[in-house]
């Protein structure tokens, strides 16, 4: 899978997305990597 | 609202070193990475690299990887890219850019600083 | 690194026009394309993620397709305001790279 910072982010945006946005606060795109997912 | 922004233009002679500023503001400027562009005139767009706010780590395009320095202070949410040992192909207007969650989900671009390498 | 080629390079067309840009990598990307319109001296202001998502604000009227190494951008219905020069970029793998254009002028 894609672990460049912007591939993290939009990744990061969609599982945010379908959360609803709960998640921790400090589950940011510079605080993960992409192992995260 | 979202906004970064960038440094005045610059005219430096060549050889010498420059270091722009980009100032975030309207987000959490530590949760996002910051990456800057260059356009040189009448030309295409070119990735130098990003910085991670959060931690000082960083990812170089090759091409400038020894000349071009990210950084950043977060007490101020201000982003820094210095450029040495400049050329006359360093001419070009210098874009800050960052992809933010929240407040908004959007890459949103500085107003771009226009260096001009000259004696 | 990727390389990336756009075509046309140039498209003369008018209002109400339907247009189709293509991209295409120099190796597969998987969806990871990101499209911008920029307007002379100004800032690339973002269009589409992931290949076909538009961000918040973007038009309808702007829509993207593709994956690996071809993708294309397509308007609808051009609007005066898109008279622009439009470049893609990959993000799939580092350093990030970008098309060299496709500027479209008014017919």
């Known amino acids: 899978a894609c672990d460049t910072a912007t591939c993290v982010t939009h990744r990061l945006a969609g599982l945010l997305s379908r959360s609803g946005g709960v998640v921790k606060n400090n589950f940011v795109p510079t605080n993960v990597g992409s192992k995260a997912f | 609202q979202v906004q970064l922004v960038q440094s005045g233009a610059e005219v430096v002679k060549p050889g010498a070193s420059v270091k722009i500023s980009c100032k975030a503001s309207?987000?959490?400027?530590?949760?996002?990475?910051m990456n800057w562009v260059k356009q040189a005139p009448g030309q295409g767009l070119e990735w130098i690299g990003d910085v991670n706010p959060n931690n000082g780590g960083t990812h170089y395009n090759q091409k400038f990887k020894g000349r071009a320095t990210l950084t950043v202070d977060t007490s101020i949410s201000t982003a820094y890219m210095e450029l040495s040992r400049l050329r006359s192909d360093d001419t070009a207007v210098y874009y800050c850019?960052?992809?933010?969650?929240?407040?908004?989900?959007?890459?949103?671009w500085g107003q771009g600083t226009l260096l001009t390498v000259s004696s | 690194d990727i390389q990336l080629t756009q075509s046309p390079s140039f498209l003369s067309t008018s209002v109400g026009d339907r247009v189709t840009i293509t991209c295409k990598a120099s190796q597969n990307v998987g969806p990871n394309v990101a499209w911008y319109r920029q307007k002379p001296g100004k800032s690339p202001k973002a269009l589409i993620y992931s290949a076909s998502y538009r961000y918040s604000g973007v038009p309808s009227r702007f829509s993207g397709s593709g994956s690996g190494t071809e993708f294309t951008l397509t308007i609808s219905s051009l609007q005066p305001e898109d008279f622009a020069t439009y470049i893609c970029?990959?993000?799939?793998?580092?350093?990030?790279?970008f098309g060299q254009g496709t500027k479209l002028e008014i017919k």
């Open positions: 309207g987000y959490t400027f530590t949760d996002y990475y």
């Open positions: 970029q990959q993000y799939n793998y580092y350093p990030y790279t």
């Open positions: 850019a960052s992809i933010t969650i929240v407040p908004v989900y959007f890459d949103f």
